[in-house]
Amino acid sequence: AGVFELQIHSFGPGPGPGAPRSPCSARLPCRLFFRVCLKPGLSEEAAESPCALGAALSARGPVYTEQPGAPAPDLPLPDGLLQVPFRDAWPGTFSFIIETWREELGDQIGGPAWSLLARVAGRRRLAAGGPWARDIQRAGAWELRFSYRARCEPPAVGTACTRLCRPRSAPSRCGPGLRPCAPLEDECEAPLVCRAGCSPEHGFCEQPGECRCLEGWTGPLCTVPVSTSSCLSPRGPSSATTGCLVPGPGPCDGNPCANGGSCSETPRSFECTCPRGFYGLRCEVSGVTCADGPCFNGGLCVGGADPDSAYICHCPPGFQGSNCEKRVDRCSLQPCRNGGLCLDLGHALRCRCRAGFAGPRCEHDLDDCAGRACANGGTCVEGGGAHRCSCALGFGGRDCRERADPCAARPCAHGGRCYAHFSGLVCACAPGYMGARCEFPVHPDGASALPAAPPGLRPGDPQRYL
C-alpha cells in the first residue's frame, strides 16, 4: 500500500507564438482545479480503461480575473498535493492523465459551470520510495509543469511497496537474516509471512500465508506468466502443466467494493460500479457533493450542496458511470454492419464501409454498379439475377455488350413466365401475383411464407415490363 503524490508547479501559456487567451475574464472570473487519473501501465488497453490505480481531484485554486490587455500569465494554482492512495503493490510502470479544469464563477443559473481546459497524458516508469520526478507536458498552447512520486505507507517498503517493516525488537541490530529497512534504519525488514514458495519478484502479501500476484502473473505462487493461450477455464490462462488455470477465487469473490458497490471482473482485475455519492477504485470515497466537482469529463452535476443530498452526473456523449469517469468504448458494441471499420472519434462515431455498402452504420447494401457504364441502352439496377446491368431487349452480359435472351436472367418473380417481346420482356404472373415482374403477391397467406398460388384466383393478365 502507498500513495502517489502529484505536485502541480505551473499551468500557463507554453513557449512560442500563439499564446492562448486567458480562460478567465472580468465578466467571467474563474478558478482552476486539477484531476489526475492513474492506470497500471503494463496493460495495452490502458488508454481506455478506467482509473484502475485510482483518481484524485485537487482543491479549487484562487479566483482569477484577467487584467484587460495583459497576456495570459501562469494561472493561480490550488494549494497542496494531489494524492492517490493505492492499496496493492505499486506497479512500477503506470499511465497518467492530468486534466486542468476551469470553474466559471459568473452568475450562471444553477451554480458554477465546469469546462475542461487541457488534458495531458503519458506513460512512465517509477519506483516507489524514489525522489520526486519532474515533468513538463504540453496540451495545445498550454504548458503544465509538475512533479510526482510514489511512496509506501508503513509498514510497506521497497520499490513496489511489497516488503513489510516492523520496529526493531532489539535496540542494536536486526534478527538473523533480516536487513534494516532503509530509509527507516530504526526498523527491520519483517520476517517473511507470505505463503511458502510465493514468488519474491511477482508475488506479495499483506496477510500471513497469502500470495497475491502483481499484474501479469498468476498461479497460487505467482510463478506463471499470464499468457494469451486459449483455455477452457473461465478464469483464463495459466497452470504450468496444462497452460490453463483451474478456476479459483476470482477478483470479485468477497466483493471488494464498499458502500454497496457492485463488482464486475475485468480481464486483469475487477471494476466497481459505485452508487451515487461514492467513488474511488473500491467505492471507498464518500461525502461528495456538486461542490466537490465529482463529475469528470465535462459531466454536468445536479444535486444539493449539503453532504446528505445525492448528486447526479449527466454525462456527455462518450462517457458513462456514476461520475462520468468511464469512457464508453462505443466500437465494442460493433455498431458498423457488414464488416465496416469502426472509428471512435470521441465527439462522434464513424463507420468506414466496405465496398458495396453505405450509410452511417454501413447498413445499406448497395449494388456494385456505381460508376459502371451499361452498353446498348442498358441501365444499372439491382435485380435480374447476377447481371449488374438491366439490359435492353436483345442484349445481355455484364455490361450489355452481348446479344442475349432477355429472359435468361429470370426477371419474373414468384414463378412468373417470361416472354421476349418486341417492345420489351413480358412476365405472365403465376396466379395470385401481380406487378411488372410479379413481385407483389395479391393475397399473401401469412407474413413469412407465401403460397405459390392461393386457390380460387384466376391467373393475372401478362404484365409488360418496359
Partner: nanobody, 117 residues
Framework: EVQLVESGGGLVQPGGSLTLSCAAS????????MAWYRQAPGKKRELVAG???????YYMDSVKGRFTISRDNAKNSVYLQMNSLRAEDTAVYYC???????????WGQGTLVTVSS
C-alpha cells in the same frame, strides 16, 4: 437481411388523412420492390399499393385516386399517403419488400389504422 419498421398509424375520422412510413434498414430501398398491404379483422391480407425497384406504381382499385405510394431513397423509406379515408380502410397496414438479389420477401410488424367517427 432487410428490416422494416412501420409508423404513422392511428385513429382518424372519415374523410381525414394519414401518412404511413416504412423505414428499411440493412439494405437500400432503391433496389427493392416495396408495397403496402392491409388486413382487416377476419379478412385476408390484401395488396393496397406497390412500387417496383424501377419506380412503377400499382394500386388496388378501391384506393386509386385516394392513396399514393412513394419512396425516398435518401431517407431509405417508403410512404403511403392516404386521403379521403373511409371506415372500410380500417385495418392493420403492413410494409412489404421484395429483394431481387436473393429473391426473398420481408415484412414489417404492422401499424393499426382506425377510421371512425
Amino acid at each position: 437481411e432487410v428490416q422494416l419498421v412501420e409508423s404513422g398509424g392511428g385513429l382518424v375520422q372519415p374523410g381525414g388523412s394519414l401518412t404511413l412510413s416504412c423505414a428499411a434498414s440493412m439494405y437500400s430501398v432503391s433496389f427493392l420492390s416495396m408495397a403496402w398491404y392491409r388486413q382487416a379483422p377476419g379478412k385476408k391480407r390484401e395488396l393496397v399499393a406497390g412500387i417496383s425497384n424501377e419506380g412503377s406504381t400499382y394500386y388496388m382499385d378501391s384506393v386509386k385516386g385516394r392513396f399514393t405510394i412513394s419512396r425516398d431513397n435518401a431517407k431509405n423509406s417508403v410512404y403511403l399517403q392516404m386521403n379521403s379515408l373511409r371506415a372500410e380502410d380500417t385495418a392493420v397496414y403492413y410494409c412489404y419488400a421484395y429483394k431481387w438479389r436473393s429473391r426473398s420477401t420481408y415484412w414489417g410488424q404492422g401499424t393499426l389504422v382506425t377510421v371512425s367517427s
